[in-house]
C-alpha cells in the first residue's frame, strides 16, 4: 500500500504534476461507500445535485459512479502509488456531464456540470489505504482529502501522516 511516511514528499509534487494525455487509461462504474459501509448517494433537487452519505434500506440499489483513471507524471523519483514516477488520478461522475469538484474555499465537495477538458478541481489523486479502502486527495490542494462530515462529503485537511488512516477519509469502491 502507499507508504504513509512518504505522503508529504508525494503530495508536494501535485501542484506541478500534469496529466499525461487527455484520455483515461481505464474507466469503471463502481458504487462508492464509506469505511463504515454507508452509501454515497446523489439526488437531483431544484435542478442541482445533492450528495448524501446514508444507510440504504436492505434492497435499495446503490448509486453508481463512473470513475475515469488518468496517469499523471510524478516529478520526483519517490515511489508512490502506481507506476514508478507516475500516480493515478481519478475523476468521479455519478451522472452524465456532472463531476465531483473540490471547492477549496468552502471546504466542500460539489457536483458541477461541465465540459471536457475538466478543470483541475475535478481531479483527485487515488491513494491505496488499509483495509483495501482508498482515499481521494485534491489535485488542487495537496493534503486535502474528500471525507465525511455530518452525513455529507466535505474536504478535510490532513496535516499529519497518522491522520491519513482516519476512517472519515476512507472509501470503498465496490463492484456493482
Amino acid at each position: 500500500a502507499f507508504g504513509i511516511s512518504g505522503v508529504q514528499k508525494y503530495t508536494r509534487a501535485l501542484h506541478d504534476s500534469s496529466i499525461t494525455g487527455i484520455s483515461p487509461i481505464t474507466e469503471y462504474l463502481a458504487s462508492l461507500s464509506t469505511y463504515n459501509d454507508q452509501s454515497i448517494t446523489f439526488a437531483l433537487e431544484d435542478e442541482s445535485y445533492e450528495i448524501y452519505v446514508e444507510d440504504l434500506k436492505k434492497d435499495e440499489k446503490k448509486d453508481k459512479v463512473l470513475l475515469s483513471y488518468y496517469e499523471s507524471q510524478h516529478p520526483s523519483n519517490e515511489s508512490g502509488d502506481g507506476v514508478d514516477g507516475k500516480m493515478l488520478m481519478v475523476t468521479l461522475s455519478p451522472t452524465k456531464d456532472f463531476w465531483l469538484h473540490a471547492n477549496n474555499k468552502e471546504h466542500s465537495v460539489e457536483l458541477h456540470k461541465c465540459e471536457k477538458p475538466l478543470p483541475d478541481q475535478a481531479f483527485f489523486v487515488l491513494h491505496n489505504m488499509h483495509s483495501n479502502c482508498v482515499s481521494f486527495e485534491c489535485k488542487t490542494d495537496p493534503g486535502v482529502f474528500i471525507g465525511v462530515k455530518d452525513n455529507h462529503l466535505a474536504l478535510i485537511k490532513v496535516d499529519s501522516s497518522e491522520n491519513l488512516c482516519t476512517e472519515n477519509i476512507l472509501f470503498k469502491l465496490s463492484e456493482t
Epitope: D81, M129, S131, K172, E175
Partner: nanobody, 125 residues
Framework: QVQLVESGGGLVQAGGSLRLSCAVS????????MGWFRQAPGKEREFVAN????????YSSDSAKGRFTISRDNAENTVYLQMNSLKPEDTAVYYC??????????????????WGQGTQVTVSS
Amino acid sequence: QVQLVESGGGLVQAGGSLRLSCAVSGRTFSTLNMGWFRQAPGKEREFVANIGWSGGTTYSSDSAKGRFTISRDNAENTVYLQMNSLKPEDTAVYYCAADIKGLYFPRDARSFDYWGQGTQVTVSS
C-alpha cells in the same frame, strides 16, 4: 502496462498439491488487487480467489477456501495460489489477474485490468 507471468502448473494426481506463482512487473505491486481465475474446457472463466493490496482475501466457495490459499509477497512482487487436496474437477487453465483501480475485493473478471497467459493444471484420477 502490467506484465503477469504464471508458473507452477502441471499434472498431479487426485489428492495432491500444487503451488502456482504469478510474477508481476510494470506497476507498484503493493497497490494492486490480485486474483486467480480458472477456465475449464468448454466452460466460462470463473473466480477462484483474490487478495487485496492490504492483504485481505476472499474465495469463490467454501470448497476453495478449505483447499486453496492465496497469498502475496510484496517484496518479491509475486502472488501465489497454494492448492491442496486437488480433485479432477479442478482441471483447468489458471489465470492470474491484476486490478489497478483500487476496488474493494473484486471478484468479477471484467473488473480486472491485466491478465497473465495462464498455466495448465491437470488433475488425474
